[in-house]
Amino acid sequence: APTSSSTSSSTAEAQQQQQQQQQQQQHLEQLLMDLQELLSRMENYRNLKLPRMLTFKFYLPKQATELKDLQCLEDELGPLRHVLDLTQSKSFQLEDAENFISNIRVTVVKLKGSDNTFECQFDDESATVVDFLRRWIAFCQSIISTSPQ
């Protein structure tokens, strides 16, 4: 029969695991919100106004199903910030693009871990910034929907 000490330690482990899952869920929801905010601003901006925004190429992973695949998103945050910096104007304003991208990067690292040994396998096909954001939004939604509540 299990002792009281082993029962309490397994309960603590379960609670810790549940807490980690809740945190992971919160981080995913935060990342999803940030990506949706960016996409919303770009779409409200009437994509057509800035051809230079849509001429930029972004790279997507061959397949993204796990949190470690967020490395592929982290790898593209530099170019994403570059596009945001370039597209600042009267009708498309992000108060602090650097801070916005920095927050996304922090959330991504919390989710995938700080180990950068995983090398992203990018797809041969590239995407516009709009399609890039849509793809990562779908990724977050998929992980959230399959996570234990």
Epitope: N47, L48, K49, R52, M53, T55, K57, L86, E125
Partner: antibody, heavy 117, light 109 residues
């Protein structure tokens, strides 16, 4: 049908001014950039600049900055390219083209400008 | 100023495959577009965003991209494909558009 119709051929003398036009139809003219492209006789295409008719935001190639002016009148769905003082080297075919998210997808038929004394 | 480099001419026999390259430093981050221009006519878009084909353009036209080079491929070239082909893209800031110098495709025979 989506199309751009340009004004007719022009023959001018050096030093004269000129304004050529490009009228859009079959789409919302306001919300697509219009680009201008030069093609000198027997030569390739050169991007001159673009204008966004909704607010007349303009971008010029460094090679054409200060040499030409683009403008637009969204009320009549027309973009313009103008010169204050023409030179013989301005002799060329000038195309307007609509820039959408998928490049210069619709082109005008071109306006031939000849500058000769 | 930013430049795109194309070979001045390419010659192929009917039915063969023609490949026209275009190179530029910004191409890893900027999409490329290809236009066909026949004598006395306005250019026509044949490939957009590196690899996409507009409706109405024959399937024998395709595009690919690798690093600083993009390629227009015409498989099973036909006599009617004889024309000048131009690549177009933007500088690294996306501000200025630019055309390559153009490639004259000659269909032999």
């Amino acid at each position: 049908e989506v199309q751009l119709v340009q004004s007719g051929a022009e023959v001018k003398k050096p030093g004269e001014s000129l304004k050529i036009s490009c009228k859009g139809s079959g789409y919302n003219f306001d919300t697509y950039w219009i680009g201008w492209v030069r093609q000198m006789p027997g030569r390739g295409l050169e991007w001159m600049g673009t204008i966004y008719p909704a607010d007349s935001d303009t971008r010029y190639s460094p090679s054409f900055q200060g040499q030409v002016t683009t403008s637009a009148d969204k009320s009549i769905s027309t973009a313009y390219l103008q010169w204050g003082s023409l030179r013989a080297s301005d002799t060329a075919m000038y195309y307007c083209a609509r820039f959408s998210s998928s490049a210069y997808d619709i082109w005008g038929q071109g306006t031939m400008v000849t500058v000769s004394s | 100023s930013y430049e795109l480099t194309q070979p001045p001419s390419v010659s192929v026999s009917p039915g063969q495959t023609a490949r026209i390259t275009c190179s530029g430093d910004a191409l890893p981050r900027q999409f490329a577009y290809w236009y066909q221009q026949k004598p006395g006519q306005a250019p026509v878009l044949v490939i957009y965003k590196d690899t996409e084909r507009p409706s109405g353009i024959p399937e024998r036209f395709s595009g690919s991209s690798s690093g600083t080079t993009v390629t227009l491929t015409i498989s099973g070239v036909q006599a009617e494909d004889e024309a000048d082909y131009y690549c177009q893209s933007a500088d690294s800031s996306g501000t200025y558009h630019v055309f390559g110098g153009g490639t004259q495709l000659t269909v032999l025979g």
